[in-house]
Interface confidence: low
């Protein structure tokens, strides 16, 4: 689509005569009829196939025609066409005399024609005017012409339609040749594809407008390059969505089972050595001078009651010292200078002579002990605490401080390993003497039924259009990661494509 423009500049009819040679009375009131048609080697009558236009009376006899001349006419004259400009044309310009105001062909006398020119040739689309002058015996016409494209039409023959737009169907302006030039942030043949945020992951991210980065299911982060681990994953990471790969020292389906209590909690005190002995279980090996499950208690050397026969123990920097009662001597007061005659047995103990009276032995009543029945029986002496429990004197009673995994007054009861429900995915727990055992349901295996073996939501290939399938372990369902151009829970729907365009 375009416009053939004709600019009439000057018409000379000095004698004021018609084509017949007859003079106009009082002068030739001149208007023009223009006929534009397809190229003819010899311009002949017939339809003005490219269009026609008439002017009002522009002047009398000889006159110059100004741009956009008065009297309601337009200069240049416009001959619009709605087809591909063929590059060739024929042009007929007739000058007519108007005796009255009615310029219709049927209202004019047949001899009202002043002059008629006909040209034909090639004409390329362009802004430059071609100047021409046609002279006959009595008249001269100077004019110029050109062909330009209508709005939204481009190219050598005005056949390329391009309308700038900024909507769902495209975001572009038109170049001089009619090709599209995408607005910033858009790309693709019709500039419909937004350019996502720089660095936005090609597969895991997408965008609906420029500089955006929206993550597909299972991905997160500004650039959608961080996978989302399994829901509830505590001390683990992922390399693909919904994984839970445990960090060093952690185990279990959600990596919440502590396999390295020593490192994570440093329970052993006073420089003791810690050894992991299972989930949340450890053993402290104390340095000399310390005791307790966590080696938190400072050990006095007198605590082992090294002094015999009622000797009293005194702690010293480099050990201990026994103060012996009368009749005894030796490092631990183990040697006696007494006999039964000296009544050495205290607290109602009975004395028995030995070695022909050179020695004796005391038989103590209940609750007393020692070589002279001088000691009240220590409630912990019999080491009543089972399973490595530590005995503590507390007033008239005694208490056992149990090691992890044991309970009861004397640490005689095994804590049920099943109390913590360690079997995943509905496994059944059985307490054993040295631990526990899980009986797993169909589809799971492993020490804690944490390994999925057969039920796999992705096994049936539920995702369409080459989408990637991920199994959500917590719900036994799948998630489809769609490739570009598809949506839906199974990536079954293509994103709506734009209608075709005329160019």
């Amino acid at each position: 689509s375009g416009v053939f423009q004709l600019q009439l500049q000057e018409f000379i009819n000095e004698r004021g005569v018609l084509a017949s040679g007859r003079p106009c009375e009082p002068g030739c009131r001149t208007f023009f009829r223009v006929c534009l048609k397809h190229f003819q080697a010899v311009v002949s009558p017939g339809p003005c196939t490219f269009g026609t236009v008439s002017t009002p009376v522009l002047g009398t006899n000889s006159f110059a025609v100004r741009d956009d001349s008065s009297g309601g006419g337009r200069n240049p004259l416009q001959l619009p066409f709605n087809f591909t400009w063929p590059g060739t044309f024929s042009l007929i310009i007739e000058a007519w005399h108007a005796p009255g105001d009615d310029l219709r062909p049927e209202a004019l006398p047949p001899d009202a024609l002043i002059s008629k020119i006909a040209i034909q040739g090639s004409l390329a689309v362009g802004q430059n005017w071609l100047l021409d002058e046609q002279t006959s015996t009595l008249t001269r016409l100077r004019y110029s012409y050109r062909v330009i494209c209508s709005d939204n039409y481009y190219g050598d023959n005005c056949s390329r339609l391009c309308k700038k737009r900024n909507d769902h169907f495209g975001h572009y302006v038109c170049q001089p040749d009619g090709n599209l030039s995408c607005l910033p942030g858009w790309t693709g043949e019709y500039c419909q594809q937004p350019i996502c945020l720089s660095g936005c992951h090609e597969q895991n991210g997408y965008c609906s407008k420029p500089a955006e980065c929206l993550c597909r299911p299972g991905w997160q982060g500004r650039l959608c390059n961080e996978c989302i681990p399994h829901n509830g994953c505590r001390h683990g990471t992922c390399s693909t969505p919904w994984q839970c790969t445990c960090d060093e020292g952690w185990g279990g389906l959600f990596c919440d089972q502590d396999l390295n209590y020593c490192t994570h909690h440093s329970p052993c005190k006073n420089g003791a050595t810690c050894s992991n002995s299972g989930q949340r279980s450890y053993t402290c090996t104390c340095r000399p001078g310390y005791t307790g499950v966590d080696c938190e208690l400072e050990l006095s050397e007198c605590d082992s009651n090294p002094c015999r026969n009622g000797g009293s123990c005194k702690d010293q920097e480099d050990g201990y010292h026994c103060l012996c009662p009368p009749g005894y001597y030796g490092l631990h007061c183990e040697h006696s200078t007494l006999s039964c005659a000296d009544s050495p047995c205290f607290n109602g103990g009975s004395c028995r002579e030995r070695n022909q009276g050179a020695n004796y032995a005391c038989e103590c009543p209940p609750n007393f002990t020692g070589s002279n029945c001088e000691k009240k029986v220590d409630r912990c002496t019999s080491n009543p605490c089972a399973n490595g429990g530590q005995c503590l004197n507390r007033g008239p009673s005694r208490m056992c401080r149990c090691r992890p995994g044991f309970t009861g007054t004397y640490c005689e009861l095994h804590v049920s390993d099943c109390a913590r429900n360690p079997c995943a995915h509905g496994g059944t727990c059985h307490d054993l003497e040295n631990g526990l055992m899980c009986t797993c349901p169909a589809g799971f295996s492993g020490r804690r039924c944490e390994v999925r073996t057969s039920i796999d939501a992705c096994a049936s290939s539920p995702c369409f259009n080459r989408a990637t399938c991920y199994t959500d372990l917590s719900t036994d369902t799948f998630v489809c990661n769609c490739p570009y151009g598809f949506v839906g829970s199974r990536c079954e729907f293509p994103v709506g494509l734009p209608p075709s365009f005329p160019w």
């Epitope: 397809h38 339809p47 196939t49 087809f83 063929p86």
Partner: antibody, heavy 114, light 107 residues
Amino acid sequence: EVQLVESGGGLVQPGGSLRLSCAASGFTFTDNWISWVRQAPGKGLEWVGVINPNSGATEYADSVKGRFTISADTSKNTAYLQMNSLRAEDTAVYYCARDNFGGYFDYWGQGTLV
Amino acid sequence: DIQMTQSPSSLSASVGDRVTITCRASQDVSTAVAWYQQKPGKAPKLLIYSASFLYSGVPSRFSGSGSGTDFTLTISSLQPEDFATYYCQQSYNGPSTFGQGTKVEIK
């Protein structure tokens, strides 16, 4: 004298094919475009397609696109309409017409019934 | 595609009557409209092109007018040979489309 003469019409089963010819005379064949226009019995006129014999460029109505093909032999001053996968609704009188640059049909053939 | 709607679809008139047929385009078609006359068993004949230009050899009682979306074909004084079906056609944009036709019958 400008003349357009169609031939090749006839009876054909649905799904069948037919080729119509349009022999032109009295004007420069390569300087003009040739259109095919059809008219179903008792109905109005429907433009089918057009060819520029000089370049071979063609355009088609959506209703026939992919099934009909227009071609021209400039040595014989003849345009052709090849019709494939014919349907009952293609039943019509087919006219060829000279399509001048304004897009108007100034000369028509007598028509051929398909 | 651009739709061309003609009215009336048929009319009865007598010789000498002034007859007007209208055609409305579904969108602006400038002046790219032609009118044709068709008699039974014959090919259509061009009467008017570019909305208002009389084709050579066509009697001057036929005239056309309009631009944009509304167009009119007028027969100033109906003659016996004018009883026929008349079609409008646009060639402005996209595929060329015709009106559905107006049948002019003898009253």
